[in-house]
């Protein structure tokens, strides 16, 4: 199957955007559907026959001249300038700014909290299953299985630190070697990048915003996947990570350190612990084949317990089971021995919502999953709206320039490395790469940060999360110190190696190009984003897991042909774009393949059929809510439904619709104001700081 859909004529043109994305398109005009409309202008448009409004297919072919969709949008300021305001206006504006800041921080707080709850929800739903993945004995001999287990477990528990700590405890208790643990750590690195990809999905409402957000999120995925693609075979062949980290661990006489400082957790924990508290030891116990743990609930019930160590007499099947011959006796019928037991006395119950419900983990997990996703989505929308109203005019210009501008020549190259350090520092502060990259995603979406700048920040985030792990390792108890430190260092050097591969030389920054390609496809076919998520984080790892269980022969038998086909397609694609004359006429483009193998259009039709009915219902519901809301606030245009719903309404009223390019499917106030869609009366409430 062709890796890039809709590759009609292979032109040696690297700037050609794939899958009909809103980019520079082949300049051939298209039958009667041409329009002069460019982004954010109200030029006349040719009216066309209306496509089903719930279809995700592009409504028209792109205009001949369209701006690069990756250029940051100009966030226009419609407010009255600061200098033109009277004292009352300035005071009002000042308090409005303070109010917005408070709101922004509030939503940001609940956004981070919802990420924490989301992680807990995933652990409740899939934590035990994740633990059981680890109890597979084939991990020791099969690095590929270790890799996919790392991915699956981290995706299931939504926390690389949880999966890493399980690995550490397994290495400490000799259930796993460091060599076998390295691929799992690599997999955990991949798995952790799903969180910000999920966050990006929340911005699906606006095509251009979604394009940027999704590309910004998946740049992390591609970096991790590509790093593993290169470094796992290198590690299997040379064991360089194992050797380097072993030398470091052996050359230093480490003393147990302090715990890594919990900076963000200090603020979020008081809230999240009121929602749910988990006993994360259960997952580790399952991973270590503890049968009793399988029946334990992950929901923590008792928070205050008293542990007492005592010696008790216990019966044993035979004298062979005695702790020692001298501590063995009989009562005439049964054999007895003395055992040191630790018994836990429950003193005080935890204070969270689910403490007295006694619901199964799956039920609690499902409830929390739905609620946390709703809160996450709501907070994200509000953050984007607030940022949208704040970051306008000169404010936006200053911020964008500060973040996205390079140092002056000849130090321009240093900017990216500073961004890596900033990313690492910020991640160290918030103690979670997921939180940092998830917070970055909406900023990329609304156009505050470019993908080129987000890339080093994300790489830095990868480093930051490993420094946290190193600190945590140094705080480990004696027996776990060596193994946890070595694993944390493996994680660190893996990310350093990845950065060396995919960052220093601009030509090698493949993740950016791949993410942009995926962003383009996903902006046009939004269902493809979900498809990508399922394929890369669930289906591929599960398939490899299944094949690995079947044995090496099966894995190689299926894997080698698949890898061969992928390499063949990539080589062909490279030749088509670089030197097509080398190829026979038939292979110079993908037209020899059936349409469904080279384009997403046929698939889009299938998906549209499935989602159409649901979307109709959803929009009806949306319309009712919108009308109720508008009645309440007594303004007819204050609340607008999504583009899909507007189209539906207009289609039902039998009107002809002027079709806009994907870029104009905006839903943020700024764009509406810029296009004169929002009444002028609304703009007087807007104010800019400068």
């Amino acid at each position: 199957m062709a890796p890039w859909p809709e590759l009609g004529d292979a032109q040696p043109n690297p700037d050609k955007y794939l899958e009909g994305a809103a980019g520079q398109q082949p300049t051939a005009p298209d039958k009667s559907k041409e329009t002069n409309k460019t982004d954010n202008t109200e030029a006349p448009v040719t009216k066309i026959e209306l496509l089903p409004s719930y279809s995700t297919a592009t409504l028209i072919d792109e205009p001949t001249e369209v701006d690069d969709p990756w250029n940051l949008p100009t966030l226009q300021d419609s407010g009255i300038k600061w200098s033109e305001r009277d004292t009352k206006g300035k005071i009002l504006c000042f308090f409005q700014g303070i109010g917005r800041l408070i709101l922004l921080l509030g939503f940001l707080y609940f956004f981070v909290c919802s990420l924490d709850i989301l992680s807990s929800a995933f652990q409740l739903v899939g934590g035990k299953m994740a633990g059981q993945f680890f109890s597979n004995s084939s991990i020791m001999s099969n690095p590929l299985l270790g890799l996919v287990i790392g991915v699956l477990v981290t995706v299931l528990v939504q926390s690389s630190s949880t999966s890493t700590s399980i690995v550490v405890s397994m290495v400490s208790s000799s259930l796993l070697t460091v060599r076998a643990a390295i691929p799992i750590i690599m997999g955990a690195n991949i798995g952790t990048s799903i969180t910000n990809t999920i966050v990006a999905l929340m911005q699906v409402g606006d095509r251009s915003e979604f394009r940027r957000a999704f590309a910004g999120a998946t740049v992390h995925d591609f970096f991790n996947w590509l790093s593993v693609l290169v470094l796992l075979p290198v590690e299997v062949a040379t064991h360089y990570l194992e050797i380097i980290t072993q030398l470091i661990v052996e050359s230093f006489h480490f003393k147990n350190g302090e715990d890594a400082p919990d900076l963000l957790k200090v603020i979020t924990k008081p809230f999240t612990k009121l929602i749910v508290q988990l006993d994360k030891k259960v997952i580790s116990q399952i991973a270590m084949n503890d049968e009793k743990a399988k029946n334990k609930s992950l929901v923590k019930i008792w928070c205050k317990t008293f542990t007492n160590k005592t010696q008790i007499n216990v019966t044993v099947p035979s004298t062979a089971n005695c702790t020692s011959p001298s501590l063995c006796w009989t009562d005439g019928i049964q054999n007895w021995t003395m055992k040191n037991v630790t018994y836990k006395e429950n003193i005080a119950k935890c204070q969270h919502i689910f403490v007295n419900f006694h619901l199964p983990d799956l039920a609690v997990g499902t409830i929390l999953l739905i609620l946390s996703l709703l809160v996450l989505c709501g907070c994200l929308i509000m953050i984007v709206k607030i940022l949208g109203s704040v970051l306008k005019g000169q404010v936006a210009t200053v911020i964008k320039k500060t973040i996205n501008t390079d140092f002056p020549f000849p130090f321009a190259w240093l900017t990216g490395y500073l961004a890596i350090l900033v990313g690492a520092g910020m991640t160290f502060i918030v103690q979670s790469s997921s939180v940092f990259t998830s917070a970055l995603t909406p900023l990329i979406g609304i156009g505050v940060i470019t993908i080129e700048r987000a890339y080093p920040l994300t790489l830095g985030s990868n480093i930051g999360t490993t420094t946290t792990a190193i600190l945590a390792a140094l705080a480990s108890p004696g027996n776990a110190l060596r193994s946890s430190l070595q694993i944390a260092l493996c994680h660190f050097f893996f990310n350093i190696s990845g950065i060396l591969l995919w960052y220093p030389i601009p030509f090698t920054r493949l993740p950016i190009r791949m993410a942009k390609g995926l962003g383009n496809i996903s902006a046009k076919y939004r269902w493809f984003a979900v498809f990508y998520l399922i394929i890369f984080f669930f289906l591929i790892p599960l398939t490899v897991f299944g094949l690995s269980l079947a044995g090496w022969r099966v894995l190689v038998g299926v894997g080698v042909p698949v890898v061969f086909i992928i390499i063949l397609v990539l080589c062909l694609r490279l030749l088509q774009s670089r030197c097509p004359r080398v190829l026979p006429k038939k292979l110079q483009n993908w037209n020899f393949l059936p349409l469904w193998m080279r384009s997403l259009k046929p698939w889009d039709a299938v998906v549209s059929k499935f989602t159409g009915c649901f979307q109709m219902r959803c929009c009806c519901c949306c319309r009712v809510c919108c009308r109720a809301c508008c009645l309440l606030c007594d303004c007819p245009k204050c609340c607008r439904c999504s583009k899909c719903c507007e189209d539906l309404e207009e289609a039902q009223e039998g009107q002809d619709v002027p079709v806009k390019a994907p870029e104009t499917f905006d839903n943020i106030t700024i764009s509406r104001e810029a296009q004169g869609e929002v009444p002028a009366s609304d703009s007087k409430t807007e104010c800019t700081a400068l």
Epitope: N313, S326, C328, W329, T330, D331, G332
Partner: antibody
């Protein structure tokens, strides 16, 4: 207080069987093991076996397996020992003794039943 | 079976004397040893268990010591009512076994 009552003496013919009783009072019969011990002037004290009345579980000294059968009646809090195919060597004093919970020391003993095997 | 050996069959002491009765196990029994007193015409009575622990109501002149294979039972201030047979018993493993007994007599 804890009491274990045994009949004073049993006179039996060789080859016959005897079932001696040990009626308990003053404690919960089902919580402690009941041991049976044989005492002869020549052999000293010999452990025959024990029964746990709670479950009816028994353990025997290999020497007395097949010779002695231990039973317990929870309703009357009485332990029984049946000795079969008696010979003159079975003539002795048989004690029932309560085992201390969790180990094999015997804290309370019956007065003993003197068994005389004689034709 | 574990054999419990009481080296002295008889011991003769005056009132107020100190008497030490020894018991040797054929293998390590830890501290799973009990001592009994049996007066003529009576049933045995538990004095010591776990080699050193006095049973309730037993006077403190009776003490036990030892672990592993060698055990000692001591009466520190012999009284006339202490004239009896003294048995050791192991309960380290089945079958439970007793020593042959040591008879304490008055001089």
């Amino acid at each position: 207080q804890v009491q274990l009552q045994q009949p004073g003496a049993e006179l039996v013919k060789p080859g016959a069987s005897v079932k001696m009783s040990c009626k308990t009072s003053g404690y919960t019969f089902t919580t402690n093991n009941m041991h049976w011990v044989k005492q002869t002037p020549g052999q000293g004290l010999e452990w025959i076996g024990a029964i746990y009345p709670g479950s009816g579980a028994t353990a025997y000294n290999q020497k007395f397996k097949g010779k002695a059968t231990l039973t317990a009646d929870k309703s009357s809090s009485t332990a029984y020992m049946q000795l079969s195919s008696l010979t003159s060597e079975a003539s002795a004093v048989y004690y029932c003794a309560r085992g201390m919970y969790g180990h094999g020391a015997m804290d309370y003993w019956g007065q003993g039943t003197s068994v005389i095997v004689s034709s | 079976d574990i054999v419990m050996t009481q080296s002295h069959k008889f011991m003769s002491r005056s009132v107020g004397d100190r008497v030490r009765i020894t018991c040797k196990a054929s293998q390590d029994v830890g501290t799973a040893v009990a001592w009994y007193q049996q007066k003529p015409g009576q049933s045995p009575k538990l004095l010591i268990y776990w080699a050193t622990t006095r049973h309730s109501g037993v006077p403190d002149r009776f003490t036990g010591s030892g672990s592993g294979t060698d055990f000692i039972f001591t009466i520190s201030n012999v009284q006339s009512e202490d004239l009896a047979d003294y048995f050791c018993q192991q309960y380290s493993s089945n079958p439970l076994t007793f020593g042959a007994g040591t008879k304490l007599e008055l001089k």
